[in-house]
Interface confidence: low
């Protein structure tokens, strides 16, 4: 039985050219996390594997940094980065938990929501 829940940074916004942290947290379960996948729509951005560590998709390596923790840092944001991001927790014995974050990248300093998740 899957008892866990995923908490995420929810809907967040950031300024073009800036950076932001995408963060998910799995709680209310004792299941072991074996791997976390970070995906943007249908693209795999990064994997954090319990045995192998982090692997960033080479096409994003210049703009994506692992962490903090199991989160993901997006840098040099562009308007094209706007969209849905998913953290997919593979756990044993529970199975798969998925969290959703919506990121909006804004042209100007209208990015007040989620500002606390931004990197100065």
């Amino acid at each position: 039985m899957m008892t866990g829940t995923i908490e995420t940074t929810g809907n967040i916004s950031a300024e073009k050219g800036g950076s932001i942290i995408l963060q998910c947290h799995l709680s209310s379960t004792t299941a072991q996390v074996t791997q976390v996948n970070w995906e943007q729509q249908d693209q795999l951005l990064a994997i954090c594997n319990a045995d192998l560590g982090w692997h960033i998709s080479p096409s994003f390596k210049d703009r994506v940094a692992p962490g903090p923790g199991l989160g993901l840092t997006l840098q040099s944001l562009t308007v094209n980065d706007t969209g849905e991001y998913f953290c997919i927790y593979h756990t044993y014995p529970d199975g798969t938990y998925t969290g959703r974050i919506f990121l909006e990248v804004l042209e100007s300093s209208v990015a007040e929501h989620g500002a606390r998740f931004q990197i100065p």
Epitope: Q35, I47, N49, L52, G53, W54, H55
Partner: nanobody
Framework: EVQLVESGGGLVQPGGSLRLSCAAS????????MGWFRQAPGKEREWVAS???????WYADSVKGRFTISADNSKNTAYLQMNSLKPEDTAVYYC???????????WGQGTLVTVSS
């Protein structure tokens, strides 16, 4: 000593196919990923595709739908099936691998692929 040895390059006509192989030896552990990069004359080396030990694959936009990367973990060998080749695919293709997360740890010597009529 770790070695990556590429094979399968050659001359092919536009629209043709080639299959590159990369045999890795000397690893204490299986590489966490293996991949292919290429360098065309007078250009920077660019990433083409990579495959994780768990089977996940990534492709550069320029080769999506035409190239397929795969790996035989038991043999520590990666393959790049290249279909619908174009003259702009002409380059030296390099195999690369990584044992831990971070930078690419190992590189092959490269194999030349020429697409020309």
């Amino acid at each position: 000593e770790v070695q990556l040895v590429e094979s399968g390059g050659g001359l092919v006509q536009p629209g043709g196919s080639l299959r590159l192989s990369c045999a890795a030896s000397g690893f204490t552990f299986s590489p966490s990923w293996m991949g292919w990069f290429r360098q065309a004359p007078g250009k920077e080396r660019e990433w083409v595709a990579s495959v994780l030990r768990g089977g996940y694959t990534w492709y550069a936009d320029s080769v999506k739908g035409r190239f397929t990367i795969s790996a035989d973990n038991s043999k520590n060998t990666a393959y790049l099936q290249m279909n619908s080749l174009k003259p702009e695919d002409t380059a030296v293709y390099y195999c690369a691998s990584e044992v831990a997360s971070g930078e690419t740890d190992y590189w092959g010597q490269g194999t030349l692929v020429t697409v020309s009529s």
